[in-house]
C-alpha cells in the first residue's frame, strides 16, 4: 500500500496524460483522481507508464469500485489488466465480446494465466453457454483452450460451435474429451457430403465407436496413419482386416511401422493370421489357424 | 533504494560452468512489474544482453540466441535472488558480467534502471 | 537482432563546449503509442552503466539537465549542452522494444 500523502502544489492531474510517467509512485497516488482515471482509463494504454506506476493505478481503481469494476472501465483496462488477480476479476461481470478479446489481447504471447482462465470462466457462465464467436476468439488466442475444459463443461458446447474448431484446437485432447466432442461434430457435419464430411470429421475421429468406422470403411476415405494412431483401441479391436484395408486405402502399408504400438499392435492381435498375410506386410502376431477367436466381452470376462 | 549485489568466482576452466548470483535488496525477485537480467561486457561483443527471468502469474525465462544452449537463469524466492549458469564456457566467454533490474514498461519493454556492480569473470586453464 | 550503430566512436571535447552523439537503428523503435523505446546511458570508468536518458528524450532521474535526448524512428541524438570533467566514461545507446535488447558499441567521451 502507498501511504496517503497530499498532493505538491500545481500536480493535481488534470486529465491522465504523458506528463504522469514523471509522477513518483506516491505521486500518482495522491495527485489522479481515481474517478478521472475511470473515466479516462482508454488513455492509460497509450502512455508508457512503468508496471510499478500501474500498480498505484489500479490500488486507486479499486478502492473507487471495491465490488468490482464496470464494464467500461474493465473493456479500456489494457495492460492494467496483467496487474489483476483472480479474486478482483470473479467480481466483474463481462457480457462483451469485444471486451474479452481486448483483454486477451494484452496477455498474448503469455500462456493462458490463472487471471485470463478466471475471466473467460466468468465470461463463458455469464453467456451460458460456450457459442461459436466466442470459442473462435478463445480458440484464437489459445489453440490448446478446447483441450483445457473438463468433458463435463464440453458437453456444453453447441454442435454449430464445432464449425470454429481448427485441427490443430484438438491436438492435446484426451479420449473422454474426444468422446464428447466426437458426437457434436458428427451431428454438425451431418449434412456434408463424403469427402468434405471426411475432411471435418477427421480430428474428432479419436471419439468415433467401431460402427461409425466401419461405415467410414465403405467410402474410399484414405485415412491416414496418424488419424488411425489416435482412434480408440476398443473401437478399432472388431475392425475385420478388410475393413481397415478399406479405411486406409493406399496408407495401409504404414501399419508395419506401427505393428508394436496401439492401437495397431492389440487390433493385430485380434485378427487370424491368414488375414493378415493378406496384406503382403509381414505383420505377425495374429491368430493361428485353427485357434478359437473368443467374443472380446468374453475375454474380460476371463482375464 | 533496489541495490543488485553480485557474487560468484572470478575464474573459471574451460568447460566448466560459470555460476553467479544476484542478491536483490529493495524489491522483490517475484514482482511482477519487472524482469531480473544478465548482461555481460568484453571488448569483442560490447554489452551483451543474455536473458532474463520473470514472474507473472509463472516464471518465465527469456535467452538471448547465442547462449541459448548453454545459459540458465533461475529465480530462488527463499533468498530473494537471482542466479546466472552458462554451461560448457570458452575464453570467448570471459567478460564482465552484470545482474541488472528491467523494470518493464507499457506495452511490456525492458528498461534497465538499476544494475550490479559487476564481476570479471576469466575463462582460463 | 536489431543492431545500433553509435557514432563518432570516440570524441574529446573541451570543458563548457557542447558535444553530441548519434546512434541508428536497424528497425524503427518508434512503437504505435508514439513513444521511442531507446535509452541512453553513461559508463563511468570502473563501474556499472547508469540510465541517462528513456523514451528517447525523457531524462532519468538525478540526470542534469545539460543532457538532452532527441530524435525518432531510427536516427537519435543525445547532446550535453555544456561537457563537464565528471561527464568522462562511454555513452551506450540501446533499444528495447524489439527482443532481444541491444547496445550500440559505445562512444568514448574524453576531457581535452
Known amino acids: 500500500e502507498v501511504e496517503k500523502t497530499a498532493c505538491p502544489s500545481g500536480k493535481k492531474a488534470r486529465e491522465i496524460d504523458e506528463s504522469l510517467i514523471f509522477y513518483k509512485k506516491w505521486e500518482l497516488e495522491a495527485c489522479v483522481d481515481a474517478a478521472l482515471l475511470a473515466t479516462q482509463m482508454d488513455r492509460v494504454n497509450a502512455i508508457p507508464f512503468t508496471y510499478e506506476q500501474l500498480d498505484v493505478l489500479k490500488h486507486k481503481l479499486d478502492e473507487l469500485y471495491p465490488q468490482g469494476y464496470p464494464e467500461s472501465v474493465i473493456q479500456h483496462l489494457g495492460y492494467l489488466f496483467l496487474k489483476m488477480s483472480p479474486e478482483d476479476i470473479r467480481k466483474w461481470n463481462v457480457t462483451s465480446l469485444e471486451t474479452l478479446k481486448a483483454l486477451l489481447e494484452v496477455n498474448k504471447g503469455h500462456e493462458m494465466s490463472p487471471q485470463v482462465a478466471t475471466l473467460i470462466d466468468r465470461f463463458v457462465k455469464g453467456r451460458g453457454q460456450l457459442d461459436k464467436d466466442t470459442l473462435d476468439t478463445l480458440t484464437a488466442f489459445y489453440p490448446g483452450y478446447l483441450c483445457s475444459l473438463s468433458p463435463e463443461e464440453l458437453s456444453s458446447v453447441p454442435p454449430s460451435s464445432i464449425w470454429a474448431v481448427r485441427p490443430q484446437d484438438l491436438d492435446t485432447c484426451d479420449p473422454r474429451q474426444l468422446d464428447v466432442l466426437y458426437p457434436k461434430a458428427r451431428l454438425a457435419f451431418q449434412n456434408m457430403n463424403g469427402s468434405e464430411y471426411f475432411v471435418k470429421i477427421q480430428s474428432f475421429l479419436g471419439g468415433a465407436p467401431t460402427e461409425d468406422l466401419k461405415a467410414l470403411s465403405q467410402q474410399n476415405v484414405s485415412m491416414d496413419l496418424a488419424t488411425f494412431m489416435k482412434l480408440r483401441t476398443d473401437a478399432v479391436l472388431p475392425l475385420t482386416v478388410a475393413e481397415v484395408q478399406k479405411l486406409l486405402g493406399p496408407h495401409v502399408e504404414g501399419l508395419k511401422a506401427e505393428e508394436r504400438h496401439r492401437p495397431v499392435r492389440d487390433w493385430i492381435l485380434r485378427q487370424r493370421q491368414d488375414d493378415l498375410d493378406t496384406l503382403g506386410l509381414g505383420l505377425q502376431g495374429g491368430i493361428p489357424n485353427g485357434y478359437l477367436v473368443l467374443d472380446l466381452s468374453m475375454q474380460e470376462a476371463l482375464s | 533504494q533496489v541495490q543488485l549485489q553480485q557474487s560468484g568466482p572470478g575464474l573459471v576452466k574451460p568447460s566448466q560452468t560459470l555460476s553467479l548470483t544476484c542478491a536483490i535488496s529493495?524489491?522483490?525477485?517475484?514482482?511482477?512489474?519487472?524482469?531480473w537480467n544478465w548482461i555481460r561486457q568484453s571488448p569483442s561483443r560490447g554489452l551483451e544482453w543474455l536473458g532474463r527471468?520473470?514472474?507473472?502469474?509463472?516464471?518465465?525465462?527469456d535467452y538471448a540466441v547465442s547462449v541459448k544452449s548453454r545459459i540458465t537463469i533461475n529465480p530462488d524466492t527463499s533468498k530473494n535472488q537471482f542466479s546466472l549458469q552458462l554451461n560448457s564456457v570458452t575464453p570467448e566467454d570471459t567478460a564482465v558480467y552484470y545482474c541488472?533490474?528491467?523494470?518493464?514498461?507499457?506495452?511490456?519493454?525492458?528498461?534497465?534502471?538499476?544494475w550490479g556492480q559487476g564481476t570479471l569473470v576469466t575463462v582460463s586453464s | 537482432d536489431i543492431v545500433m550503430t553509435q557514432s563518432p566512436l570516440s570524441l574529446s571535447v573541451t570543458p563548457g563546449e557542447p558535444a553530441s552523439i548519434s546512434c541508428r537503428s536497424s528497425?524503427?523503435?518508434?512503437?504505435?503509442?508514439?513513444?521511442?523505446?531507446l535509452d541512453w546511458f553513461l559508463q563511468k570508468p570502473g563501474q556499472s552503466p547508469q540510465l541517462l536518458i528513456y523514451?528517447?528524450?525523457n531524462r532519468a532521474s538525478g540526470v542534469p539537465d545539460r543532457f538532452s535526448g532527441s530524435g525518432s524512428d531510427t536516427d537519435f541524438t543525445l547532446k550535453i549542452s555544456r561537457v563537464e570533467a565528471e561527464d568522462v566514461g562511454v555513452y551506450y545507446c540501446?533499444?528495447?522494444?524489439?527482443?532481444?535488447?541491444?547496445f550500440g558499441q559505445g562512444t568514448k567521451l574524453e576531457i581535452k
Open positions: 541488472a533490474r528491467g523494470i518493464f514498461v507499457v506495452p511490456a519493454v525492458p528498461r534497465f534502471d538499476y
Open positions: 529493495g524489491d522483490s525477485v517475484s514482482s511482477n512489474s519487472v524482469a
Open positions: 527471468t520473470y514472474y507473472r502469474s509463472k516464471w518465465y525465462n
Open positions: 528497425l524503427s523503435l518508434l512503437h504505435s503509442n508514439g513513444y521511442n523505446y
Open positions: 523514451l528517447g528524450s
Open positions: 540501446m533499444q528495447g522494444l524489439h527482443t532481444p535488447p541491444s
